[in-house]
């Protein structure tokens, strides 16, 4: 070994200076007699080395690095040898920080593993190997006097927690506990905890279960859940309080907390929930009134609340078959009476014969919004209910009565936009209780079964905007019937379009006669089409070879036209435009040539 480095300290505070000396022995005679010692930190040459020859012939270079800003680096002492740098010796330098005081030390007692688990936050990175030790002692009092020491607990590398096993614990007796952090630059200690392991006990949560329905127990009310829990048996002797949390499975709702519940409640009816909704529930417990830690939340239990009977008003409307007046088609619409009006599973129409107490005969049971049934001859009234698994809505009576009320007058309809129609009327006297408005395709597509209907509850209304099932270019029949206390008025009807269509094509032009300066044209008008506006007029256009255009407007009843003032022996392009209020369409172009001056007229 020709050279040897010694340093003031191999480990320093990051940013602190460091001094190193390198001595080259005299017996390295193969070297230059006055060798220049160079210093390198990592890969970089470091200036500032002070070199001297000592009395024994050795060469010494001393360097002070003012700030060691690398957490780890190699310092090398070198010589130039030929064209390369020869390393004579090197040392590893390390820089970092003394350990910060470990903080947030906390412990919990696990009664299943019979160990006290303590964890802490080690603080910022020291950049140096730092060991942590959980230290503790038993104490009779409040940890002012130290009793027996407990074996140090050393966590596995990189871990910030450690378990003190049962054999080192004394329950119901205080322990002093702290963390010591140590590295080459110093030692630090966390504030000491003084605790009885039982005061930091963390229990296992109960297991939530659904309650087995018993025959004598009443079923849960709508929006309620009946549940029970199986406590963690080993913890049952510990007084605890528990809390339950729940949230609907769907949607973004946050957890709602219910508590405190005594652990011993063992069963519970949770109410005030949404009916017919799936909920996720969890429970946790804590030693109480003595100190402790909350248990983890239990595994989830998923339960569905019972639904509530439908709370709806059923608006009804009916129609008799013309060929068989005892066959009735009944229509209805559910109108929610509350925000959550309950799920509707189906509808039942029933009739109670007079003189048969309690006997109810179902006429139909359906999930649709209408049904057709044969009305018994003595029946003047039926009852309609909506139902689900929780029960039925209040029955809606439907009375089948003659049309004895006054009719409304001046029924009219007009388009609002392509998808709505306004129907208006003059109310009769006395005012009706309301109206039924029906609408559907008019002839030729008319069908009773495909009609849409609405109930207008306001008897003083003078119109209604139809927004459902209205399409442009279709003819609609709109029927309005006034409703009275025990009867109805005669139905009135009107036809209307929400938007009419331009003519689909204009008639074809035909040449009937032609001369030198005139041409007689004719056409067959298109038959009127439903959904299309009637024609308002025709316009005929003709263009000569010089691209001059001429036109004439003709009334809608025209069937022909004579073009005058044409040039002989000239080419003309002619087309017809058919127009209505909804737009216009052009015919195909007819091309013709007038006769030469010496030619005879063609008829």
């Amino acid at each position: 070994e020709c050279g040897h480095i010694s340093v003031s300290a191999p480990i320093v505070h990051l940013g602190d200076p460091i001094t190193a000396s390198c001595i080259i022995k005299q017996n390295c005679s193969h070297l230059d007699p006055e060798p220049q010692i160079l210093w390198r930190l990592g890969a970089e040459l470091q200036p500032g080395g002070r070199q001297q020859r000592l009395s024994d012939g050795t060469q010494e270079s001393i360097i002070t690095l003012p700030h060691l800003n690398h957490t780890q680096a190699f310092l090398s002492c070198c010589l130039n040898w030929g064209n390369s740098l020869q390393i004579l010796d090197q040392v590893e330098l390390r820089a970092g920080y003394p350990p910060a005081i470990p903080h947030n030390l906390s412990c919990l007692m696990n009664l299943t593993t019979s160990s006290l688990i303590c964890q802490w936050e080690p603080g910022p990175e020291t950049h140096l190997p730092t060991s942590f030790t959980l230290k503790s002692f038993k104490s009779r009092g409040n940890c002012q006097t130290q009793g027996d020491s407990i074996l140090d607990c050393v966590p596995k590398d990189g871990q910030s927690h450690c378990c003190i096993p049962r054999k080192h614990l004394l329950l119901y007796q205080n322990m002093g506990i702290w963390v010591q952090a140590e590295n080459a630059l110093g030692t630090s200690m966390s504030p000491q905890l003084c605790l009885d392991p039982m005061d930091v006990v963390k229990l296992e949560p109960p297991m939530l279960r659904t309650m087995d329905p018993s025959p004598e127990a009443a079923p849960p009310q709508a929006g309620c859940l009946q549940l029970c829990w199986e406590p963690w048996q080993p913890g049952l002797h510990i007084n605890q309080k528990c809390e339950l949390r729940h949230k609907p499975q769907r949607g973004e709702a946050s957890w709602a907390l219910v508590g405190p519940l005594p652990l011993e409640a063992l069963q519970y009816e949770l109410c005030g929930l949404l009916p017919a909704t799936a909920y996720t529930l969890q429970i946790r417990c804590i030693r109480w009134p003595l100190p402790g830690h909350w248990s983890d939340w239990s595994p989830s239990l998923e339960l569905r609340t019972t639904e509530r009977a439908p709370t709806v008003r059923l608006d009804t409307w009916w129609r008799q078959r013309q060929l068989d007046p005892r066959t009735v088609q009944l229509f209805w619409k559910p109108v929610p009476l509350e925000e959550d009006s309950g799920r509707i599973q189906g509808y039942v129409v029933s009739w109670r014969p007079s003189g048969q107490a309690g006997a109810i005969l179902p006429l139909c049971n359906t999930t649709e919004l209408s049904c057709t049934f044969h009305l018994p001859s003595e029946a003047q009234e039926v009852a309609l209910v909506a139902y689900n698994s929780a029960g039925t809505s209040r029955p809606t009576p439907v009375v089948f009565s003659e049309s004895r009320g006054p009719a409304l007058t001046r029924l009219h309809a007009m388009a609002r936009d392509p998808h709505s129609l306004w129907v208006g009327w003059e109310p009769p006297n006395p005012w009706p209780q309301g109206y039924v408005i029906e609408w559907g395709l008019g002839p030729p597509s008319a069908s009773n079964s495909n009609k849409t209907w609405r109930m207008e509850q306001n008897g003083r209304a003078t119109g209604f905007l139809l927004k459902e099932n209205i399409r442009p270019f279709q003819l609609y029949e709109i029927i309005v019937t006034p409703l009275y206390q025990d009867t109805m008025g005669p139905s009135q009807h009107v036809y209307a379009y929400s938007q009419e269509m331009a003519p689909s094509h204009a008639p074809e032009l035909h040449l009937k006669h032609i001369g030198k300066t005139w041409a007689q044209l004719e056409w067959v008008p298109e038959p009127p089409e439903l959904g299309k506006s009637p024609l308002t007029h025709y316009t005929i256009f003709w263009t000569n070879a010089q691209n001059q255009s001429f036109s004439a407007i003709l009334n809608a009843s025209s069937r022909g036209f004579v073009l005058h003032g044409l040039e002989p022996a000239s080419l003309y392009h002619i087309h017809l435009m058919a127009a209505s209020q909804a737009g216009a369409t052009n015919s195909t172009v007819l091309t013709l040539m007038t006769l030469t001056p010496e030619g005879s007229e063609l008829h």
Epitope: L111, T112, T113, S114, R166, K167, L171, M198, P231, Q233, P234, L236, H237, I238, N239, P262, E264, A265, L266, R287, P289
Partner: antibody
């Protein structure tokens, strides 16, 4: 002074009933589970029943289930054991015990003798 | 239900002897095991709870160890007042079963 005092033991015919009481003093009775343990003459200890601090949980040994009922009155600091349909094999010294949080019987009464014999 | 088996059912020993009594549970009970001492005509007395915790006022010659299913009560140096019957009891389940007992007699 912390103590438990049993009473109500005595001689009873098979099929008869007896009610044991245990008066507690010196500690907050309502915070602790309590229990009954019995010992037949010349035999070992047999746990009979326990009751939670508020009385909501009451486990029983299979040998007495359906015949014995444990109860407590926290306002009177008293524990009870109602014994019905008594059998000869129920003859024993009945001890009242205060239970700790880990199920240990921390404190025992002096015992009361129940003899079931015709 | 958990069954508790104690062994031996009886033993003879002299003052100063080290005495070991074992208790086995039919299933794992963590550390939920308690030891009691009973002298003739007296109520039992709690010695050790939660497998190894010495009850207040109990001499330190008594110690407990074990977890899971196998447990031991050790009297490091038997004293004249220690001749009695010793019982183990599990409290993992709320049906608190006792072992059959071990009678420690003077040799």
């Amino acid at each position: 002074e912390v103590q438990l005092l049993e009473s109500g033991g005595g001689l009873v015919q098979p099929g008869g009933s007896l009610r044991l009481s245990c008066a507690a003093s010196g500690f907050t009775f309502s915070l602790y589970w309590m229990g009954w343990v019995r010992q037949a003459p010349g035999k070992g200890l047999e746990w009979v029943s326990s009751i939670s601090s508020s009385g909501g949980v009451t486990p029983y040994a299979d040998s007495v289930k359906g015949r014995f009922t444990i109860s407590r009155d926290n306002s009177k600091n008293t524990l009870y054991l109602q014994m019905n349909s008594l059998r000869a094999e129920d003859t024993a010294v009945y001890y009242c015990a205060k239970l700790g949080e880990l199920g240990q019987s921390m404190l025992w009464g002096q015992g009361t003798l129940v003899t079931v014999s015709s | 239900d958990i069954q508790m088996t104690q062994s031996p059912s009886s033993l003879s020993a002299s003052v100063g002897d080290r005495v070991t009594i074992t208790c086995r549970a039919s299933q794992g009970i963590s550390s939920y095991l308690n030891w009691y001492q009973q002298k003739p005509g007296k109520a039992p007395k709690l010695l050790i709870y939660y497998a190894s915790n010495l009850q207040n006022g109990v001499p330190s010659r008594f110690s407990g160890s074990g977890s899971g299913t196998d447990f031991t009560l050790t009297i490091s140096s038997l004293q004249p007042e220690d001749f009695a019957t010793y019982y183990c009891q599990q409290s993992w389940q709320i049906k608190l079963k006792f072992g059959g007992g071990t009678k420690v007699e003077i040799k």
